[in-house]
Interface confidence: low
């Protein structure tokens, strides 16, 4: 089926917000910080609860300019640690393997496909 305008805009809006605000510790002004904190908490919760990473997948953090990339060295954090597979203590199962992109140690699925199903039913 043809992509609708809604199909096009919704993930892009999510992506823009995530890239702009996630872990952005140098906002345009102090008043904007609470928005960034809220977005960061929401994304952390989403990625941990739904075992997903970014909007379309871990490559979001590699492909696009982001506040996260500004704040974090690519070698140390190719993607947020919330993208890693966690143990029951909510700690990465193997942080190094996650950072290296070893299958099974990081979440390869984007969060949008997991949450768009429930959203599109309404």
């Amino acid at each position: 089926t043809a992509a609708t305008q809604q199909d096009f805009f919704t993930p892009n809006l999510f992506l823009k917000q995530m890239l702009e605000r996630y872990q952005n510790n140098s906002p345009p002004n102090n008043d904007d910080q609470w928005k960034n904190n809220g977005v960061t908490k929401t994304w952390d919760r989403l990625m941990l609860q739904d075992n997903c990473c970014g909007v379309n997948g871990p490559s979001d953090w590699q492909k696009y300019t982001s506040a996260f990339r500004t704040e974090n060295n690519d070698a140390d954090y190719p993607w947020p640690r919330q993208c890693c597979v966690m143990n029951n203590l909510k700690e990465p199962l193997n942080l190094e393997a996650c950072k290296l992109g070893v299958p099974g140690f990081y979440h390869n699925q984007g969060c949008y496909e997991l949450i768009s199903g429930p959203m599109n039913r309404h």
Partner: antibody
């Protein structure tokens, strides 16, 4: 070309309310904060507040908390400033200005409207 | 609220002269996250809206002549015009762009002899 077009001059009675508009062209107000600034004759600039048109969130200077209400209509790319319980102290030129935002990059108030003159007189 | 104090309130100079004006904030405008000072300078000519000159205390907005220079850090800031031109006749405002409310200074009125 980026422009902010403000509504025309207003002459209003004390105690009344007035609603000023600021229509953007050349950019989407969802990608900016829209600020409002007051300039009284022979006095300096006073910052009133801002709106994030993406979600309608507003922030006001404490002095204007009970005086001003900022709203936005993204479908018409327009921001509004409503001033209530007008007195002679509200006689001033009111400017709208934009602060662009994207990927956490900082922008100052780079584009301003031409200003709307409000005169409060019986 | 952060109080912005500008001095002098007005000054009269001859074209070609160097001019400096001061802006002091009651609290530091340095953002420790990126080591930038959130201090902005605007120029307002009679009958016109303010025009952005300098942001981050020292970064010139594109299109602004290089005779305008901003300097300073923390609470003390300066705007310098290296060689004043007739078209620089205006009021110059500094603004705290660090925290709500984003207060302006009272302005420095520049007049040309």
């Amino acid at each position: 070309e980026v422009q902010l077009q403000q509504s025309g001059a207003e002459l209003v009675r004390p105690g009344a309310s007035v609603k000023l508009s600021c229509t953007a062209s050349g950019f989407n107000i969802k990608d900016s904060f829209i600020h409002w600034v007051k300039k009284r004759p022979e006095e300096g600039l006073e910052w009133i507040g801002w709106i994030d048109p993406e979600d309608g969130e507003t922030k006001y200077a404490p002095k204007f908390q009970d005086k001003a209400t900022i709203t936005a209509d993204t479908s018409s790319n327009t921001a509004y400033l409503q001033l209530s319980s007008l007195t002679s102290e509200d006689t001033a030129i009111y400017y709208c200005a934009r602060r662009e935002r994207f990927y956490g990059i900082y922008y100052a108030l780079d584009y301003w409207g031409q200003g709307t003159s409000v005169t409060v007189s019986s | 609220d952060i109080v912005m104090t500008q001095s002098p309130s007005s000054l009269t100079v001859t074209a070609g002269e160097k001019v400096t004006m001061s802006c002091k904030s009651s609290q530091s405008l340095l953002n420790s996250g990126n080591q930038k000072n959130y201090l902005t300078w605007y120029q307002q000519k009679l009958g016109q809206p303010p025009k952005l000159l300098i942001y981050w205390a020292s970064t010139r907005e594109s299109g602004v002549p290089d005779r305008f220079t901003g300097s300073g850090s923390g609470t003390d800031f300066t705007l310098t015009i290296s060689s004043v031109q007739a078209e620089d006749l205006a009021v110059y405002y500094c603004q705290n762009d660090y925290s709500n409310p984003f207060t302006f200074g009272s302005g420095t009125k520049l007049e040309i002899k």
